[in-house]
């Protein structure tokens, strides 16, 4: 049994890091493998992650971690029974994928303005709480070409757009994702989408 693709890990910079790897053949990850991990820290202890299958030869492990700080470094040991298959390390702060925003809501009752709000996925004591920026994706269910991205570079988790920038009388969907420039993170997954019917009063034409 050998590792074909070494584990690569990403952290949510809060409590979970996800490591994925590939074996050289079909593997029952949960019965045959264990990923041991430990924070390099005087008061830490070793933990064991039981991997799940991720395709025939792929494995994935969700590591429960202490709150992350930038100096953290974890040792990783991948075992098959008594055989050490791979040994490595992982700095969560260097491989961050933020949590997806939640509770996306479209408020349509604000005088021909659409107000989109969502929740920051981090608690206020987390470093990323004040460092997230967002991308909002709005698209038409009727017209695949009607697809737009709004970049929200301020901290407030909200976006205002004029309803008239979208077509009236049709349904739209929106979703939002996050990233943090400070740690050069990847984008988060998209939030679940929310749907609304866009309608607004056309301005009277002057003749």
């Amino acid at each position: 049994m050998k590792v074909l693709q070494e584990p690569t890990c990403v952290s949510d910079y809060m409590s979970i890091s996800t490591c994925e790897w590939k074996m050289n053949g079909p593997t029952n990850c949960s019965t045959e493998l264990r990923l041991l991990y430990q924070l390099v820290f005087l008061l830490s202890e070793a933990h064991t992650c039981i991997p799940e299958n991720n395709g025939g030869a792929g494995c994935v492990c969700h590591l429960l971690m202490d709150d992350v700080v930038s100096a953290d470094n974890y040792t990783l040991d991948l075992w098959a029974g008594q055989q050490l298959l791979w040994k490595g390390s992982f700095k969560p702060s260097e491989h961050v994928k933020p949590r997806a925003p939640g509770n996306l809501t479209v408020h349509t009752n604000v005088s021909d303005t659409l107000l989109l709000t969502w929740s920051n996925p981090y608690p206020p004591d987390n470093y990323l709480y004040n460092h997230l920026t967002y991308a909002v994706n709005i698209w038409s269910e009727n017209d695949p070409a009607d697809f737009r991205i709004y970049n929200v570079t301020y901290l407030e988790p909200s976006l205002r757009i004029a309803a008239s920038t979208l077509k009236s009388g049709i349904s739209y969907r929106a979703r939002v994702r996050a990233w943090a420039q400070c740690y050069n993170t990847t984008w988060s997954e998209w939030s679940p989408s929310t749907k609304w019917h866009n309608s607004y009063r056309e301005p009277f034409e002057q003749h």
Epitope: S44, E45, D66, V69, D72
Partner: antibody, heavy 115, light 109 residues
Framework: EVQLVQSGGGLVHPGGSLRLSCAGS????????MFWVRQAPGKGLEWVSG???????NYADSVKGRFTISRDNAKNSLYLQMNSLRAEDMAVYYC?????????WGQGTLVTVSS | EIVLTQSPGTLSLSPGERATLSCRAS???????LAWYQQKPGQAPRLLIF???SRAPGIPDRFSGSGSGTDFTLTISRLEPEDFAVYYC??????????FGQGTKVEIK
């Protein structure tokens, strides 16, 4: 808002015992190492003890065998049981959250050791 | 055990002046594990700098940290009245734990 609220200081005779408490709020207590740091009157800061998220502990040589640090994650609380107290243990004791450094501190509680 | 020595013991300066505080370690310290704190009378210490040069949340940018190996510096670019206090450096070592310097008092001249 992260808060650490301390209780349990007071006057004790040499050789006596005292238990300090520290209640945390505004953060996930169970995912953070916690510490005790003390400051003798007019002196500098001295690390006393620390406890990891899994319960691993460490002590300064000056208190080893006499002090015991513990935590109750269900109550978001940190404790320091101090036995065989000496005159040199007299200090303001601070609880702190942290790891390699201490990012949030309690308000401090005075422990007076005197006959 | 790593010993941290701070100098000077007392720094007498006027508001608006630049303060330079030194922290010297008896052995090399990883930059990741060097921090600075401010303490005012009757108050708990407050984290200013971690990782030798990163400002803690809410700390004004007049505070900066630098250095590596055994020599570290805390600089206050322009002293404000509220900056007069005692400053401590602190290091973490994987085997010996946490140690503080003896402190530098910044007082009004």
């Amino acid at each position: 808002e992260v808060q650490l609220v301390q209780s349990g200081g007071g006057l004790v005779h040499p050789g006596g015992s005292l238990r300090l408490s520290c209640a945390g709020s505004g953060f996930t207590f169970s995912r953070n190492a916690m510490f005790w740091v003390r400051q003798a009157p007019g002196k500098g800061l001295e690390w006393v003890s620390g406890i990891g998220t899994g319960g691993a502990t460490n002590y300064a040589d000056s208190v080893k065998g006499r002090f015991t640090i513990s935590r109750d994650n269900a109550k978001n609380s940190l404790y320091l049981q101090m036995n065989s107290l000496r005159a040199e243990d007299m200090a303001v004791y601070y609880c702190a959250r942290g790891r390699y450094y201490f990012d949030y501190w309690g308000q401090g509680t005075l422990v007076t050791v005197s006959s | 055990e790593i010993v941290l020595t701070q100098s000077p013991g007392t720094l007498s300066l006027s508001p608006g002046e630049r303060a330079t505080l030194s922290c010297r370690a008896s052995q090399s310290v990883s930059n990741s594990y060097l921090a600075w704190y401010q303490q005012k009378p009757g108050q708990a210490p407050r984290l200013l700098i971690f990782g030798a040069s990163s400002r803690a949340p809410g700390i004004p940018d007049r505070f900066s940290g630098s250095g590596s190996g055994t020599d570290f510096t805390l600089t206050i670019s322009r002293l404000e009245p509220e900056d007069f206090a005692v400053y401590y450096c602190q290091q973490y070592d994987h085997s010996a734990g946490w140690t503080f310097g003896q402190g530098t008092k910044v007082e009004i001249k």
